[in-house]
Interface confidence: low
């Protein structure tokens, strides 16, 4: 069971100091930008953390969320990344949702964040360049200290 | 083309702060995709990493020297620079300043593509 | 830290000759390294990196290969201006760590 709490607006960067946002095709993607452009760009680089009560708590259960025409929220469904139009939900009668991450620091870098998926245990949102892109993939953490898999996050509140 | 020379005094005394400066033309420190590292090379050794700046401040430090080691870098000079605390005998080196090219998830790229011709920095009294 | 060995140490070859350099990892590093040239007074030269990707300008006569723990650096047909130092240089895991070298000296 989760249960809404209170929500934040932030900016997320990888370690690359590239910042994410959603393009008019709705991917999650990193781009480098300057304080500007992420201002320029805004909404599409400002996420609502909504923040979740955990009956069984494993670290702070949150969604992500982009409020462009409409909100849409990231969902890891079938492991694939996308934002699906819906609000965060008020209540989530479940241990496990493709919405739900438990967003943790990384030991020994408290400004450094990882957001592991409550469905697929040991996934996390990672930052992947196919092509010319640094797209936001869920990705099975394969090894100790891999950076693509470690984000900071701005409140902009 | 990137071009990168260092700077600084040849000679430190044991227990001073070692300072260099790698000034970079040809392009900037601050555009992002590449890390800005210091190595150096003990005479007739192999080489060691000593740790790289990100444009956006972070850094990143060889866990051997950790502590003792500072990286940090001037935009507006388009210059990064190294300072090392408490040095010994075993600091004596050929220290070289390089860029790295950033990486991303699978496409990780942690080579170091163009480097200072080196400064030889013996630690004496 | 990841540890890099090299072999041999130091290898002597003639122009014309076909040699290999190994280098081996304390673990397992992926495709995560690159191969390194350096000449007396000199900073090292980026030749091969992921294992096997020519860095832009290097000579076709260097290639790279492996994965895991075990990797090699052939040149296929020494030149004179080959003879030199070369290293290995591991990123998979931070610190980034370099084998020891081998220099290749003329026979």
């Known amino acids: 069971y989760f249960g809404k709490l209170e929500s934040k607006l932030s900016v997320i960067r990888n370690l690359n100091d590239q910042v994410l946002f959603i393009d008019q095709g709705n991917r999650p993607l990193f781009e480098d930008m300057t304080d500007s452009d992420c201002r320029d760009n805004a909404p599409r680089t400002i996420f609502i953390i909504s923040m979740y009560k955990d009956s069984q708590p494993r670290g702070m259960a949150v969604t992500i969320s982009v409020k462009c025409e409409k909100i849409s929220t990231l969902s890891c469904e079938n492991k694939i990344i996308s934002f699906k139009e819906m609000n965060p939900p008020d209540n989530i009668k479940d241990t496990k949702s493709d919405i739900i991450f438990f967003q943790r620091s990384v030991p020994g870098h408290d400004n450094k964040m990882q957001f592991e998926s409550s469905s697929y245990e040991g996934y996390f949102l990672a930052c992947e360049k196919e092509r010319d892109l640094f797209k936001l993939i869920l990705k099975k953490e394969d090894e100790l200290g891999d950076r693509s898999i470690m984000f900071t996050v701005q409140n902009e509140d | 083309q990137v071009q990168l020379q260092e700077s600084g005094p040849g000679l430190v005394k044991p227990s001073e702060t070692l300072s260099l400066t790698c000034t970079v033309s040809?392009?900037?420190?601050?555009?992002?995709?590449?890390?800005w590292s210091w190595i150096r090379q003990p005479p007739g050794k192999g080489l060691e990493w000593i740790g790289s700046?990100?444009?956006?401040?972070?850094?990143y430090y060889n866990p051997s020297l950790k502590g003792r080691v500072t990286i940090s870098g001037d935009t507006s000079k388009n210059q990064f620079s190294l300072k090392l605390s408490s040095v010994t005998a075993a600091d004596t080196a050929v220290y070289y300043c390089?860029?790295?090219?950033?990486?991303?998830?699978?496409?990780?790229?942690?080579?170091?593509?163009?480097w200072g011709r080196g400064t030889l920095v013996t630690v004496s009294s | 830290d990841i540890q890099m060995t090299q072999s041999p140490s130091t290898l002597s070859a003639s122009v014309g000759d076909r040699v290999t350099i190994t280098c081996r990892a304390s673990?397992?590093?992926?495709?995560?390294l690159a191969w390194y040239q350096q000449k007396p007074g000199k900073a090292p030269k980026v030749l091969i990196y992921?294992?096997?990707t020519l860095e832009s300008g290097v000579p076709s006569r260097f290639s790279g290969s492996g994965s895991g723990t075990e990797f090699t650096l052939t040149i296929s047909s020494l030149q004179p201006d080959d003879f030199a130092t070369y290293y290995c240089?591991?990123?998979?895991?931070?610190?980034?760590?370099f084998g020891q070298g081998t220099k290749l000296e003329i026979k």
């Open positions: 390089a860029r790295t090219p950033a990486y991303f998830g699978q496409d990780r790229t942690d080579f170091f593509d163009v």
């Open positions: 040809g392009g900037s420190i601050s555009a992002g995709g590449y890390y």
């Open positions: 700046l990100y444009y956006s401040g972070s850094t």
């Open positions: 673990q397992g590093i992926s495709s995560w």
């Open positions: 992921k294992a096997s």
């Open positions: 240089q591991q990123s998979h895991h931070p610190p980034w760590t």
